[in-house]
């Protein structure tokens, strides 16, 4: 707000006497008087004590009129230099100056610690113009001071492209000690020394620190802030705080818990997220970390079959994300699974063991020793094989799939046959004479179809040929066997 008292108010007792300083009589060069573009901050009525003229920062703008009339020097009047007050109290201070109207264009602003207080709602300027002089009082008020209001305040008047600066007004807000650094919670190794820091400031200074452990003072004599407490070591959890004292009273920091690092608790809630024939995806809930971050976890897997040799497979993984896919497992097998995690102190106990099973998979090998021969009398092709080893069946055999491809004079057709699980032979009708028949066999479980055997070829002659001999799966390294009868 800005208040202007018109001429009739004439409040000039506030500004007794002549302008500060003496008039300049020498003829100084004409100096341009550019416009002032500063902001005229807001103001309010607040009488100031008439002080002696301030001669320390007198501006004598180097300006003369067209008629060489000198401009008088200008200076802010002295005011209070240092204000000490308690936090949350109100304060009001001002600077005042009398400006001859011949200056014609000025702006006044408040600055704090070198920064302009723009648009400050608690700044008020009133001015009292008459025909020769305008008396200006710039007031600054703070309704409830805080520590952040501490600092050096000045008024600046911009006039004739020069600045006139008032004496600084130092505001010192006093209150209870204010913590700038408080002790922080820590997790420490048993019987290992550690430090805690506490720092508090006034004003007023000095600030003295007492340390408190589990409600008892640690130091008999206070230490000047800042204070570092060295604790030689703990065997059990403790709570520390610090007290900061100054002439205004006492402030107590937050209490911080110092924990002793220990081995973690075992994980809980190990659960199966997904099972396949050869892998199991598990998750777990980590136990209490023992005040030390988990580093990694170990998954222990053993076959649940009583006839197994009892060996344990161990899989190490990172502590996060509490999820692990156990691979290289046998199909249709039962396993016991446990999880243990470690921190810098050591390994947790193993979680409660859980049972998990892999599912059936497709067989991993093809039937062995496939042989094929022509039974011309019945116009059939007989096929024999041996079933894959039990361990590689990856489940319970439900049968076989036979692929037979007939090729003759550029024509090719494939047929598929399904055979029950008990057999190890099959008979298929001759589809085309004077043709090559290529046979492949795959074992089938509920988990899927396994790989097909290597192809066995047999030539089926035209009607009237009598001799025949079997064709069989080739020995390794031999290419497609073809027996022509």
């Amino acid at each position: 707000a800005i208040t202007e008292a018109r001429e009739e108010a004439k409040p000039y007792p506030l500004f007794p006497g002549p302008f500060p300083g003496s008039l300049q009589t020498d003829h100084t060069p004409l100096l341009s008087l550019p416009h002032a573009s500063g902001y005229q901050p807001a103001l309010m009525f607040s009488p100031t004590q008439p002080g002696r003229p301030h001669t320390g920062n007198v501006a004598i703008p180097q300006v003369t009129s067209v008629e060489s009339k000198p401009l008088p020097p200008l200076a802010f009047k002295h005011t209070v230099g240092h204000i000490i007050l308690s936090e949350h109290k109100g304060v009001k201070f001002n600077c005042s100056i009398s400006v001859p109207n011949i200056y014609q264009d000025t702006t006044i602003s408040w600055w704090k610690d070198g920064k302009e207080l723009l648009g400050a709602h608690h700044a008020i300027t009133q001015f009292y113009p008459d025909d020769e002089v305008t008396a200006i009082i710039a007031s600054f008020s703070i309704t409830s001071v805080q520590r952040s209001d501490n600092g050096s305040y000045i008024c600046k008047m911009k006039i004739n492209n020069e600045e006139i600066v008032s004496d600084p007004i130092y505001i010192e807000v006093q209150g209870l000690p204010h913590f700038t650094k408080q002790p922080e919670s820590m997790n420490v190794t048993r019987n290992t020394a550690f430090n805690l820091t506490c720092q508090a400031v006034g004003p007023p200074e000095p600030v003295n620190i007492f340390w408190v452990q589990n409600s008892s003072r640690v130091n008999e004599q206070p230490e000047k802030s800042p204070s570092v407490l060295t604790v030689p070591g703990l065997t059990e959890m403790a709570v520390f705080s610090c007290e900061a004292h100054n002439d205004k009273g006492l402030t107590v920091s937050k209490g911080v818990q110092i924990n002793i690092k220990a081995i973690p608790s075992p994980p809980t809630e190990v659960s199966i997220r997904n099972s396949t024939a050869h892998s199991i995806l598990i998750s777990w809930v980590p136990g209490f970390d023992g005040y030390s971050p988990f580093r990694n976890c170990s998954i222990q897997v053993k076959e649940a079959d009583p006839l197994s040799n009892g060996s344990v497979m161990i899989f190490n993984t990172s502590a996060l994300p509490h999820l692990y896919q156990i691979k290289q497992l046998q199909a249709l097998a039962n396993y016991s699974i446990g999880v243990s995690c470690m921190n810098e102190i050591g390994w947790s106990a193993v979680s409660p063991w859980i049972l998990a099973s892999t599912t059936e998979g497709a067989p991993s090998v093809a039937p062995l020793n496939v042989t094929v021969f022509l039974n011309e009398s019945s116009d059939n092709v007989d096929i024999r094989w041996m079933k894959p080893p039990t361990k590689q069946q990856d489940g319970e055999l439900v049968g076989y799939r036979i692929s037979h491809v007939w090729q003759s004079a550029g024509i090719s057709k494939e047929l598929l046959e399904e055979v029950g699980q008990n057999g190890s032979r099959a008979r298929i009708s001759v589809q085309v004479h004077n043709a090559t028949c290529t046979v492949r066999i795959a074992a089938v479980t509920r988990g899927g179809v396994g790989p097909f055997s290597d192809p066995v070829k047999i030539f089926i002659p035209a009607h009237g040929w009598v001799d025949y001999a079997p064709s069989s799966t080739p020995a390794p390294g031999n290419a497609d066997p073809v027996l022509i009868i």
Partner: antibody, heavy 120, light 107 residues
Framework: QVQLVQSGAEVKKPGASVKVSCKAS????????MNWVRQAPGQGLEWMGW????????TYADDFKGRVTFTLDTSTSTAYMELRSLRSDDMAVYYC?????????????WGQGTTVTVSS | DIQMTQSPSFLSASVGDRVTITCKAS??????VTWYQQKPGKAPKLLIY???TRHTGVPDRFSGSGSGTDFTLTISSLQPEDFATYYC?????????FGQGTKLEIK
């Protein structure tokens, strides 16, 4: 009482110059800055600049720099505004207006206005 | 430059009405805003300065308010002599700039 009296209406040709006077009375002329403001027909107010009546130092608005000159005759408490190279869009009422106080930039006293017509 | 935008440009009202004219600055001008009244063929007259202070001799039905960027001129009960054009002006910084004006007409 405080008043500002301006010179009479002017009719000028494009390219010519016009000089408007503003005579102050009822106060100390050199204590108050003098501003010049114009108003085209049916339009708003446009600030042209001001002159410090004590030092004679003028300040011109950017739109008028190079074409306008403010001068003073302190012996007769008169301010002058000269506008050169007149154009048709300079046709307006030109006002002088007193700057209110040393810390204020508004106008408490205005002249009656001078109409400038630019016509070929 | 700081732009001053007045609204409305035209306002029709009757004697006894309460009317409000607003002025918006393009940037913070604190409370360095003044209002003028201008009647046809006459020079503007100062009404309000420092956003809310009435000039000497201005009737108290005229009031101003606002700070920062938003300002209002209020006429609490229109009188026949109040029908005129009203201008706001900022003087926080040079160049001094005016609003485009609000013409108050009899309904």
């Amino acid at each position: 009482q405080v008043q500002l009296v301006q010179s009479g209406a002017e009719v000028k040709k494009p390219g010519a110059s016009v000089k408007v006077s503003c005579k102050a009375s009822g106060y100390t002329f050199t204590n108050y800055g003098m501003n010049w403001v114009r108003q085209a027909p049916g339009q708003g107010l446009e600030w042209m600049g001001w002159i410090n009546t004590y030092t004679g130092e003028p300040t011109y608005a950017d739109d008028f720099k190079g074409r306008v000159t403010f001068t003073l005759d302190t012996s007769t408490s008169t301010a002058y505004m000269e506008l050169r190279s007149l154009r048709s869009d300079d046709m307006a009422v030109y006002y002088c207006a007193r700057k209110s106080t040393v810390v204020s930039r508004y106008f408490d006293v205005w002249g009656q206005g001078t109409t400038v017509t630019v016509s070929s | 430059d700081i732009q001053m935008t007045q609204s409305p440009s035209f306002l029709s009202a009757s004697v006894g009405d309460r009317v409000t004219i607003t002025c918006k600055a393009s940037q913070d001008v604190g409370d360095a805003v003044t209002w003028y009244q201008q009647k046809p063929g006459k020079a503007p007259k100062l009404l309000i300065y420092w956003a809310s202070t009435r000039h000497t001799g201005v009737p108290d039905r005229f009031s101003g308010s606002g700070s920062g960027t938003d300002f209002t001129l209020t006429i609490s009960s229109l009188q026949p002599e109040d029908f005129a054009t009203y201008y706001c002006q900022q003087y926080r910084s040079y160049p001094l700039t005016f609003g485009q004006g609000t013409k108050l007409e009899i309904k």
